[in-house]
């Protein structure tokens, strides 16, 4: 276990901060698995990746926090990023 | 509706340069398309950090930059040869989700001929 | 890299015909697929993206589905200005991949 929430927070340290800006605007409208909620828009706002992290996996686990997260930096243009993610998850 | 404005013709020589402008925002793809044949991708360019991602194939004679003060985006395309004869497309991913090209040019018309 | 394979390479049709495209991906893409409409001498443009979302003005009788790796583009009631060339798209890896498009024609 925390193989995924390394990868993640992998993940989003190596984000601009303009990047992880990006990155939670589009949090709070990527398409979600049915049963599952998303995370309150104020709770986004000052997180940093580390806190961002917790709350992917608190949220939505570790196996689907990794999938969305991939999703999200795929929606950002971040395919290699994503890839990486997913790959580090999958070892 | 936004419009992605690039030149429309350009007449190079074998071995010559080229370079493509397209006024866009945003992350800006380079496709290329030969007459009756269908598209292929030559990499992007984020306008606001840079950031940049080639296909491999043409990784070697396509140099994408960004000039951000007038939000256009370049292609030098370089060594040219016949089989690069094609129409050059840039086209934009404004859509928040999925990265699909939502906006496209007109395409520049490059011919390579002596 | 992602080899998107289109079939069939053209169709002959009447208008008002119900058409199926195909399109698949040589590996799992998600749902990261999209479908360009494409017309002599014109730029493409986006009709499907994510599989199976409409984008902006294109009429409902465009329809989009699939995921993973087998992917469609339905059109219900093909009309003349339908006629055009179709072409996938993936934007799950890079490189981006096109399939190579299907022709629609008139019978």
């Known amino acids: 276990m925390g193989r995924a929430r390394d990868a993640i927070l992998d993940a989003l340290e190596n984000l601009t901060a303009e990047e992880l800006k990006k990155f939670k605007l589009k949090l709070l409208s990527v398409p979600l698995r049915e049963g599952y909620g998303r995370i309150p828009r104020g709770a986004l706002a000052a997180m940093d990746a580390l806190d961002l992290t917790d709350k992917l996996v608190s949220f939505y686990l570790e196996t689907y926090g990794a999938e969305l997260t991939a999703n999200v930096l795929r929606d950002m243009g971040l395919q290699e990023m994503a890839g990486q993610l997913q790959a580090a998850t999958h070892q | 509706q936004v419009q992605l404005q690039q030149p429309g013709t350009e007449l190079v020589k074998p071995g010559a340069s080229v370079k493509l402008s397209c006024r866009a925002s945003g992350w800006t793809h380079w496709v290329k398309q030969r007459p009756g044949q269908g598209l292929e991708w030559i990499g992007n360019i984020n306008l606001s950090n840079g950031r940049t991602n080639y296909n491999e194939k043409f990784r070697a004679m396509a140099t994408l930059t960004v000039d951000k003060s007038s939000s256009t985006a370049y292609t030098q395309l370089s060594s040219l040869t016949s089989e690069d004869s094609a129409v050059y497309y840039c086209?934009?991913?404004?859509?928040?989700?999925?990265?699909?090209?939502?906006?496209w040019g007109q395409g520049t018309s490059v011919t390579v001929s002596s | 890299n992602i080899v998107m394979t289109q079939y069939p390479k053209s169709m002959s049709l009447s208008i008002g015909e119900r058409v199926t495209l195909r399109c698949k991906a040589s590996e799992n893409v998600g749902s990261y697929v999209s479908w360009y409409q494409q017309k002599p001498e014109q730029s493409p443009k986006l009709l499907i993206y994510g599989a199976s979302n409409r984008y902006t003005g294109v009429p409902d009788r465009f329809t989009g589905s699939g995921s993973a790796t087998d992917f469609i583009l339905t059109i219900t009631s093909v009309q003349a200005e339908d006629l055009a060339d179709y072409h996938c798209?993936?934007?799950?890896?890079?490189?981006?991949?096109f399939g190579a498009g299907t022709k629609l024609e008139l019978k």
């Open positions: 798209g993936q934007s799950y890896n890079y490189p981006l991949t």
């Open positions: 086209a934009n991913s404004m859509v928040p989700h999925f990265f699909p090209m939502d906006y």
